[in-house]
């Protein structure tokens, strides 16, 4: 999922939904749909994002995000202060450096507001998760410098 | 090609039920939520539910709650639609319509099957 | 429910002319969620547009979306015969999905 700060219209596809999915809100439900998974990526130590698929929604739907570390003095529940959105709703969550400590269990749920006992909390170990990136420099790229993954070097040309 | 194809023409007696078949091919069928839309004769589109096969969880319109019910059969692809308790005033086309995977429009509609209630 | 009235009921026109059809929502409706569907005598509805703006894959850019809030608007630039039909719009931003009673272009 292809996550912004800005809001853009997105174009047509027919991509899947991978991940279930929000409890309606005029049907009589036999159970409660899970929540889109959250995956967490931390980038050189220097930010982390946290992104679910919010296309997996029914229908548009504002998720919250809340955090924590388990069993640690940063067991306090923080709230997202920096959402990233695509079509206009929330589908991640940008952590900057103070708020990633690393070496301890971060604890991340997601929240149907909508619907509060819809909610789904996940265990992440975040040294595994760390991605290292490379600066390109002004002559590769042709002019600006961009943050650039390893994964990505020998494509940063499309950039 | 990708495309949703539906059950053929039913006439029905008030009281009765049907059930309209929509077989999808092409695309991943659990992956995008199926939408069920009719339109009376000579009428406008009124959205009626969804599945989702990935998980069969189902949303109906608060009109057609207690009459409608959606369950699809994920091993032969296929989204069903049984409507109970049929009046002269569900004749109607009934389609099955694709959600978007990324964003919430119907982006690939089934032919429609005629729905025909009379006594 | 968010109800939507489109305008006019018919509009009579010839081929080459620019056709201008109005969709107005009862309450607000967030642009990426406005769509417009193309529907022909004994076919069911085809996308033309969603996100209030964007042209759907294979849509001939004579059509085009536009507005917000209450207020949108889907413009076919030069008529062609086959753009003679019957247009909706539809809301997809929240649940009841809903769409407008339809806008029927016929050939003058």
């Known amino acids: 999922l292809n996550t912004t700060i800005l809001t853009p219209n997105g174009n047509e596809d027919t991509t899947a939904d991978f991940f279930l999915t929000t409890m309606p809100t005029d049907s009589l439900s036999v159970s409660t749909l899970p929540l889109p998974e959250v995956q967490c990526f931390v980038f050189n130590v220097e930010y982390m994002n946290c992104t679910w698929n919010s296309s997996s929604e029914p229908q548009p739907t504002n998720l919250t995000l809340h955090y924590w570390y388990k069993n640690s003095d940063n067991d306090k529940v923080q709230k997202c202060s920096h959402y990233l959105f695509s079509e206009e709703i929330t589908s991640g969550c940008q952590l900057q450096k103070k708020e990633i400590h690393l070496y301890q269990t971060f604890v991340v749920q997601l929240q149907d507001p909508r619907e509060p006992r819809r909610q789904a909390t996940q265990m992440l170990k975040l040294q595994n998760l760390v991605i290292e990136q490379k600066l390109i420099s002004e002559e590769d790229l042709g002019g600006e410098q961009k943050l650039i993954s390893e994964e990505d070097l020998h494509h940063h040309h499309h950039h | 090609q990708v495309q949703l194809v539906q059950s053929g023409a039913e006439v029905k007696k008030p009281g009765a039920s049907v059930k309209v078949s929509c077989k999808a091919s092409g695309y991943t069928f659990t992956g995008h939520y199926m939408h069920w839309v009719r339109q009376a004769p000579g009428q406008g589109l009124e959205w009626m539910g969804w599945?989702?096969?990935?998980?069969?969880?189902?949303n109906y319109a608060k009109r057609f709650q207690g009459r409608v019910t959606m369950t699809r059969d994920t091993s032969i692809t296929t989204a069903y639609m049984e409507l109970i308790r049929l009046r002269s005033d569900d004749t109607a086309v009934y389609y099955c319509?694709?959600?978007?995977?990324?964003?919430?429009?119907?982006?690939?509609w089934g032919r429609g099957t005629l729905v025909t209630v009379s006594s | 429910e968010i109800v939507l009235t489109q305008s006019p009921g018919t509009l009579s026109l010839s081929p080459g002319e620019r056709a201008t059809l109005s969709c107005r929502a009862s309450q607000s409706v967030s642009s990426s969620y406005l769509a417009w569907y193309q529907q022909k005598p004994g076919q069911a509805p085809r996308l033309l547009i969603y996100?209030?703006?964007s042209r759907a894959t294979g849509i001939p850019d004579r059509f085009s979306g536009s507005g917000s809030g209450t207020d949108f608007t889907l413009t076919i630039s030069r008529l062609e015969p086959e753009d003679f039909a019957v247009y909706y719009c539809?809301?997809?931003?929240?649940?009841?999905?809903?769409f407008g009673q339809g806008t029927k272009v016929e050939i003058k």
């Open positions: 539809q809301q997809y931003g929240s649940s009841p999905w809903t």
């Open positions: 319509a694709r959600r978007s995977g990324r964003s919430w429009y119907f982006d690939l």
């Open positions: 996100g209030a703006s």
């Open positions: 599945i989702y096969p990935h998980s069969g969880h189902t």
